[in-house]
């Protein structure tokens, strides 16, 4: 036999809330639990399962568990079943509801005098109480004609008036919780003795010396009072004006009529209605003057035909908001078509060429009308008027490569040698007609040079070739005096540039042929063994068939390179003392000699009176002191070679004597004069 | 008398490099533009770019600007081809010619050319 | 770049006959076309370059025309030595380009 262990019982429970229906069950053989809600199968969902035997509920809900539920279990093998006794729940709720009128049935029946109930629509289980409140307020019952219980929902207010004016709302309260109303009712019932509003003053905009109307108009019984204040409070009659608004009219109807209005009648109106009882009603409405500004210029702007460009309008500031059009030839654009205005747009699609011209936006607006122009321009691709063309151009001369092109707007013009931009400088410059100035051709300007011109539109190019052709000169010039070392050998080159390589061949100036040791080898002047008849003139002389000849003058000397005679030696020198650095050289022309310490020249004219350079070239140092401590370089030179040669020069201390030692007493130490030395030639 | 003598050509895989050199003599290399053509067998000509004295101005064929590299050695008097990453359409024989004049561009002295084969 | 589009691809002529051989540039190219011959086996040779100048020891039965984009190369009279392949080279921009050669032969 199937016994229940455990049974479902009836139950409080709170709407939303979990609960459970317990349910246990002892049998001999396995058996299937399920239940039943007036008397149909309970189906599982995520709100109501079975967990175990038992039915748990996640959120009661009072529509779908209300009923009885029974627990059935069953042996699928012998079919016996056994059911549980009935359960079910009290289920507690409360749900807020409106404030509705119950009487009469409509606002508009609502009259001064009249009985007026409201309902409150908020219901629960147990059965709640009611509060009502008028404007936040909690009224109480028997208080002010009107009659509430807390255990009615009903609030009645016998008779209505004036003073029950105001926004209705409940609440309620049970065992299960709070809610207040889900949507309140305001009850309006006119006292006619109160100012009531019948016509509102409207803001007005303005032109100036125009006139500006404002309409008040208010009812009561009996009529009420109408009153008009500017700004600070003035009021305006027509018998006392304020000076400046001596040109104010109040009509009987409560009307105020303002003419030839000025800057200073801008400003705040108030229209003042008082009834027999009630509060004043104040309606407040502003005088604008009417301004328009000055419209920003607009920058002139260049299109490419077959593109759609806007341009963007900005009205200027004013009051009344300007209106806003656009203009071409004096023309009103349309709102539609290729040209047309969009807003405050103008819209230019599939531009063609002809649109090309100003066109003007307009503002307007009670102040006045402004404009301003915008320049449009249809772009081009350029064209040729004349390509650069391939150039021979001479060396040393300016050249011109051309790149004349045209187009809307004038086309730039940018040229390129080797693939690289030329940026003008002081040998290249671009002309505004896009021709290229080549200042003064160079060999190395033969090479590719390309022009570009553009627009907005698109570009164009082409390339030329520039050949330079070469001046017949000297690479490098010939120096025009040079030095030969006596019985030695020597060369003295000549080398030219041209068109065609020219033939270079050498002649004595007086036009005596050279000797048999002297050869012109290609150019190059060989002497085996200089003597001293082969100084002279000499010139070089380079031609070719084009371009002729051209003639280098040389003058040859003939020398005896510098040698020293007598170098400086290292010295070293007490303090105080004389020191003596000889320096003396030979050579033809005979050297000059000069000498430098502490890397600066000395100048003999400003030496000073410790300093003295001697006729043969020897350098003395009196009273010597540590700052001249350093290196000495006898420099030898002639018109011809120069050579130089250096020595260290040490300033020591002059060591004080013991009294040990007499007055003939040897130093501690001995001067050292080392004979090592250094020389170039140059 | 102007003689310029290619070298340097022979197999190389594909993606491998050469380098072609051009020996120049007769004339004042050191003044002139020179410049390299090429010619894959039983097909047409093809210019591959040019070169000035001082090598300040380079052209090259678009289609092979970032495969070869044209240089010269003015004290070597020698004209250079450097081919990189070269594949089989780059098989032919390569000329390397003077320049004698840019304007009118006349290259009337051309050498007798190097075989390039680009092959695995 | 300028394409040189070269015309006929082959041509086979007998001895005395004119030959003619044509070239059009997508471009304008001024006169700036060049006409090369080229043996077998050898490199080519220059016979007349820009502005339709016939180059130095040139028989003078090469002649060339043309200005702009179209441009034509004339033999006047053919001879055996003639066979060979012809090209044309247009000057004016980089990068030069050839045309696709005309092959000439004996009829």
């Known amino acids: 036999a199937i016994v229940f262990i455990k049974q479902p019982s009836s139950q409080d429970a709170l709407q939303g809330r979990r609960a459970l229906l317990r349910c246990e069950v002892e049998a001999p053989g396995p058996v299937h639990v399920y239940w039943l809600l007036d008397g149909a199968p309970v189906q599982d969902t995520e709100r109501r399962f079975a967990q175990g035997s038992s039915l748990s509920f996640a959120a009661v809900d009072r529509p779908q568990d209300s009923g009885t539920f029974q627990c059935v279990a069953r042996d699928d093998v012998t079919g016996e079943e056994a059911r549980s006794a009935n359960a079910s729940f009290n289920i507690k709720w409360i749900e807020a509801g409106p404030v509705v009128l119950k009487h009469p049935a409509s606002e508009a029946e609502i009259q001064p005098q009249t009985q007026v109930t409201l309902r409150c629509h908020i219901d629960g289980h147990p059965r709640p109480t009611y509060q009502w409140f008028r404007d936040g307020t909690p009224l109480s019952d028997g208080q002010s004609n009107h009659t509430v219980s807390s255990k009615e929902r009903n609030l009645t207010l016998r008779p209505a008036g004036p003073e029950h004016s105001g926004l209705y709302s409940c609440c309620a309260h049970s065992a299960f919780g709070q809610a207040c109303s889900s949507q309140n009712f305001t009850l309006s019932i006119a006292d006619e003795s109160f100012a009531r509003v019948v016509l509102a003053p409207q803001d007005v905009v303005v032109a100036r010396y125009e006139e500006a109307m404002f309409h008040c108009q208010f009812s009561a019984q009996p009529p009420p009072s109408l009153q008009w204040l500017f700004e600070d409070e003035t009021p305006i009659t027509n018998r006392s004006r304020p000076p400046h608004l001596r040109r104010a009219t109040v009509f009987a109807n409560g009307s105020l009529l303002l003419t030839q209005v000025r800057p200073r009648n801008a400003g705040i109106y108030r229209c003042i209605g008082q009834g027999q009882r009630g509060p004043p009603i104040i309606l407040e409405a502003t005088l604008h003057l009417a301004e328009i500004e000055d419209m920003p210029l607009f920058e002139p702007r260049v299109f490419t035909a077959g593109s759609e460009e806007r341009v963007t309008c900005l009205p200027p500031k004013g009051l009344p908001e300007p209106s806003v059009w656009w203009e071409h030839a004096g023309v009103r654009l349309p709102t539609h078509g290729r040209v047309y205005q969009k807003g405050h747009e103008l819209v230019l699609a599939n531009i063609a060429e002809s649109d090309a011209g100003v066109y003007t936006c307009h503002a307007a607006n009670l102040a006045g009308q402004r404009r301003q122009d915008v320049n449009i321009t249809v772009a081009t691709v350029p064209s040729w008027l004349k390509k650069p063309q391939d150039s021979q151009l001479e060396e040393g001369k300016p050249g011109y490569l051309d790149c004349l092109t045209q187009a809307t707007p004038k086309p730039t013009v940018v040229w390129y040698r080797n693939q690289m931009l030329i940026s003008e400088d002081s040998r290249f410059e671009v002309f505004k007609n896009g021709t290229l100035r080549i200042n003064s051709v160079e060999v190395y300007d033969g090479t590719w040079y390309r022009c570009m011109s553009s627009t907005p539109a698109g570009s164009i190019e082409a390339q030329a070739r520039v050949q330079v052709l070469e001046k017949l000169k000297f690479t490098p010039p010939p120096q025009p005096q040079q030095c030969m070392e006596f019985d030695k050998e020597a060369t003295v080159p000549c080398s030219a540039t041209g068109r065609e390589k020219p033939t270079i061949k050498w002649e004595r100036a007086d036009g005596s042929s050279l000797p048999e040791w002297v050869t012109d080898n290609a150019g190059t002047l060989h002497f085996a063994r200089v003597t001293r008849d082969d100084a002279g003139n000499y010139t070089c002389i380079a031609s070719n068939g084009p371009q002729g000849q051209i003639r280098a003058h040389v003058q040859l000397t003939v020398a005896v390179f510098i040698t020293f005679k007598v170098e400086p030696e290292r010295t070293t020198v007490y303090q105080g003392h004389t020191a003596l650095l000889q320096c003396e050289a030979q050579g033809d022309p005979k050297p000059l000699i000069q000498w430098k310490g502490k890397d600066r020249i000395l100048d003999p004219t400003k030496l000073g009176p410790r300093m003295h350079i001697f006729q043969n070239g020897s350098l003395v140092i009196h009273d010597v002191a540590p700052e001249d401590s350093g290196r000495y370089t006898c420099i030898a030179g002639n018109s011809c070679n120069i050579k130089h040669t250096e020595a260290p020069l040490y300033v020591v201390d002059k060591p004080v004597p013991e009294e040990s030692e007499g007055p003939g007493s040897p130093p501690p130490y001995k001067m050292i004069q080392t004979h090592h030395h250094h020389h170039h030639h140059h | 008398e102007v003689k310029l003598l290619e070298s340097g050509g022979g197999l190389v895989q594909p993606g491998g490099s050469l380098k072609l050199s051009c020996a120049a003599s007769?004339?004042?290399?050191?003044?002139?533009?020179m410049s390299w053509v090429r010619q894959a067998p039983g097909k047409g000509l093809e210019w591959i770019g040019d070169l000035n004295p001082d090598s300040s101005a380079i052209n090259y064929t678009p289609s092979l600007k970032d495969k070869f590299i044209i240089s010269r050695d003015n004290a070597k008097n020698t004209l250079y081809l450097q081919m990189s990453k070269v594949r089989s359409e780059d098989t032919a024989l390569y000329y390397c010619t003077l320049i004698t004049t840019l304007v009118p561009y006349t290259m009337d002295f051309w050498g007798q050319g190097t075989s390039v084969t680009v092959s695995s | 770049e300028t394409t040189v589009t070269q015309s006929p691809a082959s041509l086979s002529m007998a001895i005395g006959e004119k030959v003619t051989i044509r070239c059009i540039t997508n471009t304008d190219i001024d006169d700036d076309m060049n006409w090369y011959q080229q043996k077998p086996g050898e490199p080519p040779k220059l016979l007349i370059s820009?502005?339709?100048g016939l180059r130095p020891g040139v028989p003078s039965r090469f002649s060339s025309s043309g200005y702009g984009t179209d441009f034509v190369f004339t033999i006047e009279n053919m001879l055996s030595e003639d066979v060979a392949d012809y090209y044309c080279l247009q000057s004016d921009n980089l990068p030069l380009t050839f045309g696709s050669g005309t092959k000439l032969e004996i009829k």
């Open positions: 820009e502005g339709n």
């Open positions: 007769g004339f004042d290399f050191s003044r002139y533009w």
